[in-house]
Amino acid sequence: QLTTESMPFNVAEGKEVLLLVHNLPQQLFGYSWYKGERVDGNRQIVGYAIGTQQATPGPANSGRETIYPNASLLIQNVTQNDTGFYTLQVIKSDLVNEEATGQFHVYPELPKPSISSNNSNPVEDKDAVAFTCEPETQDTTYLWWINNQSLPVSPRLQLSNGNRTLTLLSVTRNDTGPYECEIQNPVSANRSDPVTLNVTYGPDTPTISPSDTYYRPGANLSLSCYAASNPPAQYSWLINGTFQQSTQELFIPNITVNNSGSYTCHANNSVTGCNRTTVKTIIVTELSPVVAKPQIKASKTTVTGDKDSVNLTCSTNDTGISIRWFFKNQSLPSSERMKLSQGNTTLSINPVKREDAGTYWCEVFNPISKNQSDPIMLNVNYNALPQENGLSPG
């Protein structure tokens, strides 16, 4: 069975292809190659006569073809127009014809693609962006890469136009890229330069730093405002509703209690047209903005009811504070047997009764802060010797 084989089957434009012939009969008059799936004199490429060993070009001969004595046909510098079927007609020495048809496909050496975009400055959550991979070429596979990764599965990503167009629906600030497209065919592949998106967004709700609320008189007040935004936000400050300045930083030296108030940062994005504000309360005071945790001590933690007394002491290093006491979540004193002294630092119970057993704690506070001690457990016994085992935090 006469057959032909293309080497290679997929040919790069400008390269060469050899149409090999297998099972060529021994006794031959001649043979001829034709462009197409059948013998057609109008599409004859070349004929070869065994007797004269001469090749005769046909009407479809381009000058790039070479026929060999083994009937193989070499086509050099192929073009995409050469793609298709080729038929070999063999005339045996008995003048009986045999035919075989083969084919090959010519693909272009692909150029470096480029990405065009219908919107290079989209607005977050509002605009869609369509990327198109150029150029459009036949028999080409289009692939897309985001951040050097193949496309993730996302309802916001749509491929169309034979995967040549990538559409991002409702872009977000995380869609900046980079984006690359790759074109492939069976003989070559090429990737574009990366393209990044300039996604316009924000401003988000501003953050004022530092987070401190309390300042002492005489300190410097330095506040900074930041809101995520593209392009960067324009900032302005208001104090108690009154405009101060259009800067990202607000600096007030040597503050006084009069500088206490509400500080508003206003962030504006002129491209998106959006505005966001954040309000921060600043308190200027001599008082400690943070009251340290007080310590609680008991003269005894296990006492004999109706006989012993006990003193509980609440200790703190803070000044300008007040102290209050709690027993079983109730404020004290709750009976005539309980007395507070030394600015409420000491709670005396005399005599101790059964109902006084339980958990006690103290709380120190000033107008702007407070803190509680750890609880202490008072045990009340009857007809038993008291145990002197010191503090027993609960």
């Epitope: 008059f29 001649g30 001829s32 059948r38 013998v39 057609d40 004199g41 109008n42 004859q44 004929g47 006569a49 007797g51 004269t52 001469q54 005769t56 070009p57 046909g58 009407p59 007609q89 005339i91 003048l95 014809n97």
Partner: antibody, heavy 124, light 111 residues
């Protein structure tokens, strides 16, 4: 199966004209040259004319040159012979034959198939 | 262009071998290896028997063979059979202008 069927022969007066046709089938018509040969009654074969597969090249025996015209219509797989200025010595059976030339060059190729012939009689 | 020279007749008994000659010049038979032989039964169309001096087409018996020496080509029929009785014509390519010439023909008779 290769078949060649001639037609158009008949009785014609000297100086007259005829157009012979040959309908071909069973092979790729336009890759082969086609020929006409003739045989006068009781005489031998005489080559008359050959045309290349494309129809671009034509060849004639000296005895008919200028009077006979060979042509072909590849779309109809048909060969023609226009005979003008007929003489008594042109009386013969005219055979259509596949071959003479092969492909588009001038590669000689035998007359491997023949039609049954059509009789042309030139007489007053 | 003169017709090629052939013997007017050749005869032989069944089973015998006969040879028909075809003589031309160096411009035809001697100049090319394009000699063909045709068989023609009475009232029938010619049939190709040998081409390019010695090649047999499909369907032709191997009892028919051809050869050439200088300006003379030959057709040999071996094992002569009754159905071989016919007229035989040689033909040669001449040139690229006047392509072909036939022989005058030989009548083969099987005795």
């Amino acid at each position: 199966e290769v078949q060649l069927l001639e037609s158009g022969g008949g009785l014609v007066q000297p100086g007259g004209s005829l157009r012979l046709s040959c309908a071909a089938s069973g092979f790729t018509f336009n890759t082969y040259g086609m020929s006409w040969a003739r045989q006068a009654p009781g005489k031998g074969l005489e080559w008359v004319s050959t045309i290349s597969g494309s129809g671009d090249n034509t060849y004639y025996a000296d005895s008919v040159k200028g009077r006979f015209t060979i042509s072909r219509d590849n779309s109809k797989n048909t060969l023609y012979l226009q005979i003008n200025s007929l003489r008594a010595e042109d009386t013969a059976v005219y055979y259509c034959a596949k071959g003479g030339l092969l492909w588009f060059g001038e590669l000689p190729y035998p007359f491997d198939y023949w039609g049954q012939g059509t009789l042309v009689t030139v007489s007053s | 262009q003169s017709a090629l020279t052939q013997p007017a007749s050749v005869s032989g008994s069944p089973g015998q071998s006969i040879t028909i000659s075809c003589t031309g010049t160096s411009s035809d038979v001697g100049g090319y290896n394009y000699v063909s032989w045709y068989q023609q039964h009475p009232g029938k169309a010619p049939k190709l028997m040998i081409y390019d001096v010695s090649n047999r087409p499909s369907g032709v018996s191997n009892r028919f063979s051809g050869s050439k020496s200088d300006n003379t080509a030959s057709l040999t029929i071996s094992g002569l059979q009754a159905e071989d009785e016919a007229d035989y014509y040689c033909s040669s390519y001449i040139s690229t202008s006047t392509l072909y010439v036939f022989g005058i023909g030989t009548k083969v008779t099987v005795l």
